[in-house]
Interface confidence: medium
């Protein structure tokens, strides 16, 4: 609502949506119900899974994914095909800047897409999303000049995270509100799989405990975790197979050394 | 930090106009829903407007609708209330304020607007 | 349109629980915020999603929402929570506020 995409994605690869109202964020309405249903992500040109509160919010809101990729993928219903979302960065490049919540003052850096430049932010210590770097070089090598290399569209290396940031990260509650603790990820692994199976479970803002699983970067396992109905992240599945099947394929052991503790 | 100041308002007579200003800085302004809230003298809060998105779609209380135009200027991080045909009952401080979500998280100090002939 | 209901005063002793109420036929649905104000002050908000509290927020605010009463309440009461407190939802589109509330702190 208060963040919504931009009608176009001129800027977010060479597929156009269907309608304007395929560009929208994901919008889960000022009210409480949980009602699973699905919207099209302009970043990953994919159709997904929110939890939507039952009242206003916006158009982009299916309630299956074959409606969603009917009325938003362009030649869904004749080739049955995935859309491919053409971008070489991780999507949460592309992500508008969130100082969050907290009322702190940090010195960091994102991705401005306008500009396809990394810019300094104030953020405000808690929340927030993954357009967040610590460093203005950590910025530019994971967004700015992504890598380019064989492996498939969107994958980052768990290396690229494993430095002193707060970009992957364990969660902690204070106040209330989900604030980043210490990163506590694996030195010897490489993940290059979907981003989102890097973030911290995350179990929302709202008040229902909905039993989730969320896949554990460190371990390389899906873990159960209390979903509170809404907001959170998409590292978030409703079953242990659903998780393991969308992230542990990206896991790639290396063949030295295990897992630095 | 984030920080919203609010300016223009002064002593109008009815039937006048005014065109308040908030200067927002310390974040990415273009990415948030704006609106002005009112607070008469001793009296409770009272939404006037709201700016929302990248189509800058606008909303107005009725007591409002056709005598206030809400607009914004991303490249000057400011937003405007245009205020015509302006009562007695418009007197109050205006407050700009930034939506979060579903809630105001920041607020400006306000600035006082009172009509009066 | 939706009313919220608050009411127009409280009173409570320094170091006892505060309760203010915000009544409306849909707050059973809607999300509830509490916003504080004191004198000559813009407002702030103390709780948002019925429930969660700012960081920088005392932990003595807390907010509950269920039937179509948001309730904030403030535990050991001390004399700088005096203000007025506004409850805020959302209806068709647009926010509303509660009338407010005056909290005042006796003694």
């Known amino acids: 609502l208060s963040e919504e995409a931009d009608d176009t994605d001129s800027e977010l690869g060479s597929m156009k949506p269907l309608h304007t109202f395929c560009a929208m964020k994901a919008d889960d309405g000022p009210c409480k119900a949980m009602i699973r249903s699905y919207f099209f992500n302009m970043y990953t040109h994919q159709c997904e899974e929110f939890i939507y509160g039952g009242c206003e919010g916006n158009e982009n809101r299916f309630d299956t994914l074959e409606e969603c990729k009917k009325t938003c993928i362009p030649g869904y219903e004749k080739t049955a095909v995935k859309a491919a979302s053409g971008a070489e960065r991780p999507d949460f490049c592309f992500l508008e800047e969130d100082p969050g919540l907290c009322r702190g003052y940090m010195k960091r850096y994102l991705y401005n897409n306008q500009t396809k430049q990394c810019e300094r932010f104030v953020y405000g210590g808690c929340l927030g999303n993954r357009n967040n770097f610590e460093t203005l070089d950590e910025c530019k090598k994971i967004c700015e000049n992504p890598v380019h290399s064989p492996s498939p569209v969107n994958e980052v290396q768990m290396s690229d995270y494993v430095t002193d940031g707060n970009t992957v990260t364990d969660r902690s509650t204070v106040n209330n509100i989900v604030v980043p603790q210490s990163p506590k990820v694996p030195r010897r692994r490489d993940y290059r799989g979907r981003p989102w199976c890097l973030q911290p479970a995350d179990s929302g803002l709202c008040k229902a405990s909905e039993r989730r699983f969320y896949y554990n970067s460190a371990t390389g396992k899906c873990h159960r975790f209390n979903y509170t109905g809404c907001g959170g992240n998409n590292n978030n599945f409703t079953t242990r197979r659903r998780c393991l099947r969308s992230c542990k394929t990206g896991l790639i052991k290396n063949k030295s050394k295990g897992v630095v503790k | 930090q984030v920080q919203l100041v609010e300016s223009g308002g002064g002593l109008v007579q009815p039937g006048g106009s005014l065109r308040l200003s908030c200067a927002a800085s310390g974040f990415t302004f273009r990415s948030y829903g704006m609106d002005w809230v009112r607070q008469a003298p001793g009296k409770g809060l009272e939404w006037v407007s709201s700016?929302?998105?990248?189509?800058?779609?606008?909303y107005y209380a009725d007591s409002v609708k056709g005598r206030f135009t809400i607009s914004r200027d991303n490249s000057k991080n400011t937003l405007y209330l245009q205020m015509n045909s302006l009562r007695a009952e418009d007197t109050a401080v205006y407050y700009c304020?930034?939506?979060?979500?579903?809630?105001?998280?920041?607020w400006g100090q306000g600035t006082l607007v009172t009509v009066s002939s | 349109d939706i009313e919220l209901t608050q009411p127009p005063s409280v009173s409570v002793a320094p170091g006892q629980t505060a309760r203010i109420s915000c009544s409306g036929d849909?707050?059973?649905?809607?999300?509830a915020h509490w916003y504080q104000q004191k004198p000559g002050q813009a407002p702030v908000v103390v709780i948002f999603y019925d429930v969660n509290r700012p960081s920088g927020i005392p932990e003595r605010f807390s907010g509950s929402n269920s039937g179509n009463t948001a309730t904030l309440t403030i535990s050991g009461t001390q004399a700088e929570d005096e203000a007025d407190y506004y409850c805020q939802s959302w209806w068709d589109g647009v926010p509303v506020f509660g009338g407010g509330t005056k909290l005042t702190v006796l003694g």
């Open positions: 304020a930034r939506l979060y979500r579903y809630w105001f998280d920041y």
């Open positions: 700016i929302r998105g990248s189509r800058s779609s606008t």
């Open positions: 849909n707050l059973r649905k809607y999300y």
